[in-house]
């Protein structure tokens, strides 16, 4: 790892709306250097959202994650609090990006290009969506009729910045919220591990009730194919855009020294997803919100710039 | 249509262990969160614990910890929930439900299962 | 834990009656609630959840308000198949709590 950046690596030009802390795992503010401040998120679901630090909610969503942090280390867990540079513990997997949110993820490996636009059945089995149930875009075989999405807040458009598979790269997310006791989930990881190729529809998932807060994900598990195909009927709501394929290790690749400038572009502009019919009321989007969220998020490409810093070819040699 | 049907009714001893399941159908299983929530005679709601299908993050309510263990089958879409050392405090109507997993929305519970009577008596 | 206090417990009323049922947080819960109604026998039923927006085939009678810590459910016009016992939840932290519940009987 290289330490030492000062420079500002996530960009938020959108805040979110509220989030419940109960579905949150981690926060770290952004760095100094980024102007606007802002709080990054992590869902347990392993997805990043730039929240206002200004706003109660985010006041309050700290506070408690602090007082989770605090217990958990007073039950013997370990808990690093670092204020400052944020670094991804792990590589993004595709999110939902808006447009304005420029990311410089920290990355491990040699470089190597990366097509703008994998597949459909590729980018599945990248972000773990399940092929029925596509993030971001209704399913036939989606039969579930949800309540009726909220009128008054059609949701923050391409708030998420992207989702973090949980073990992945040596990167580590340096947060003020509880850490697993035992071997961490945060600590470095082998860069050459990938996600488990096994059906996930085949395996028996138990989890049992540990000791008392041990709230956070289990330990070394790994999130494929779960908060990645949410409703289909509300997976625009807050997140207009679903995540945009790409390849889950496409920056294992890059030099230790390089940052990567992600930004998302429209392949086409032809087509917008459909929804399923919701029986008291249709999806109102917020009326501040650009119409481009709404595009397909099939048709969105990422172009990812691998951008070496001066040292990072005297570190390769 | 979606549905969550739950096992029959239970008839227990104090120490023992009860398992109730909860199959799903009408959705995707493991694209829903599945909670499991106590009624007890004449008594409100109590929320025991959550599961998630897809990735296995379970979160317990302190009162239930160590007693209760969720698990699912994803080959059936079918949830369980096993509390042990039972008590006869533990005699309760148990209901499993669904909470959207847009998780950016929270956890309220939008389908029901039917409910399974647990009877824990000597 | 966030206690949710629920207020009356129960309550008689007549068929177009206008209800109001409270609900009130020990903590702020940023409109992470909902409200449920539950029969005999039955399964609680999902009415209102987040920013009071109405749960799918749920009449329009039925409408919530409040914000911080007070909440609210208001039945506008009572109908024969309102009586019922309901309950608030808020999902702003866990453990989810549930208010004690109000019964809903006819005078």
């Known amino acids: 790892q290289h330490h030492g950046v000062t420079k500002c690596n996530i960009t938020c030009s959108k805040m979110t709306s509220k989030i419940p802390v109960a579905l949150l795992i981690h926060y770290q503010q952004n760095q100094a250097s980024c102007g606007k401040r802002a709080i990054i998120l992590e869902t347990r679901q392993h997805r990043l959202f730039c929240a206002d630090p200004k706003e109660q909610w985010v006041k309050d969503a700290m506070q408690h994650l602090d007082r989770q942090a605090a217990a958990l280390t007073r039950n013997g867990g370990t808990f690093e609090k670092q204020i400052g540079e944020v670094k991804p513990r792990t590589t993004p997997a595709a999110g939902g990006m808006d447009e304005s949110v420029v990311l410089e993820p920290e990355a491990t490996g040699e470089s190597s290009s990366l097509e703008p636009t994998p597949s459909s059945q590729e980018a599945q089995r990248a972000l773990g969506t399940s092929p029925e149930l596509p993030t971001g875009v209704t399913g036939s075989s989606g039969t579930r009729l949800p309540p009726t999405p909220k009128a008054q807040d059609g949701g923050p458009v391409g708030t998420e910045l992207f989702r973090v598979p949980p073990v992945s790269t040596a990167a580590t997310w340096q947060s003020s919220a509880p850490h697993q006791p035992g071997p961490s989930l945060w600590a470095e990881a082998k860069t050459s591990e990938a996600p488990s190729t096994q059906d996930p529809s085949t395996q028996a998932s138990t989890a049992s009730s540990p000791a008392p807060e041990e709230n956070a994900p289990s330990e070394g598990q790994r999130v494929w194919g779960q908060g990645q195909s949410p409703r289909p009927e509300n997976s625009l709501e807050r997140e207009e855009m679903g995540p945009v394929p790409a390849h889950t290790d496409a920056f294992q690749d890059w030099g230790p020294g390089s940052m990567a400038h992600v930004s998302v572009v429209p392949v086409s502009s032809e087509g917008t997803p459909s929804r399923e019919p919701v029986a008291s009321g249709s999806w109102t989007p917020k009326a501040e919100e650009p119409i481009h969220a709404t595009m397909d998020p099939q048709r969105l490409g990422v172009l990812i710039t691998p951008v070496p810093d001066a040292q990072a070819a005297t570190r390769r040699q | 249509e979606v549905q969550l049907v739950q096992s029959g009714a239970e008839v227990k001893k104090p120490g023992a262990t009860v398992k109730i399941s909860c199959k799903a159908s009408g959705y995707t299983f493991t694209n829903y969160n599945i909670h499991w929530v106590q009624q007890a005679p004449g008594k409100g709601l109590e929320w025991m614990g959550w599961?998630?299908?897809?990735?296995?993050?379970?979160r317990f309510n302190e009162r239930f910890k160590g007693r209760v263990t969720i698990t699912a089958d994803k080959s059936t879409n079918t949830a369980y929930m096993e509390l042990s050392s039972l008590r006869s405090e533990d005699t309760a109507v148990y209901y499993c439900?669904?909470?959207?997993?847009?998780?950016?929305?929270?956890?309220?519970?939008?389908?029901w299962g039917q409910g399974t009577t647990l009877t824990v008596s000597s | 834990d966030i206690q949710m206090t629920q207020s009356p417990s129960s309550l008689s009323a007549s068929v177009g009656d206008r209800v109001t049922i409270t609900c009130r947080a020990s903590?702020?819960?940023?409109?992470?609630l909902a409200w449920y109604q539950q029969k005999p026998g039955k399964a609680p039923k999902l009415l209102l959840y987040?920013?009071?927006a109405l749960a799918e085939g749920v009449p329009s009678r039925f409408s919530g308000s409040g914000t911080g810590t007070d909440y609210t459910l208001t039945i506008s016009s009572l109908q024969p198949e309102d009586f019922a016992t309901y309950y608030c939840?808020?999902?702003?932290?866990?453990?989810?709590?549930f208010g004690g519940g109000t019964k809903l009987e006819i005078k």
């Open positions: 939840q808020q999902f702003w932290s866990t453990p989810y709590t």
């Open positions: 987040t920013d009071n």
């Open positions: 439900a669904t909470s959207p997993t847009d998780e950016t929305q929270g956890d309220y519970f939008d389908y």
């Open positions: 903590g702020r819960i940023h409109d992470f």
């Open positions: 599961y998630l299908p897809g990735d296995d993050s379970p």
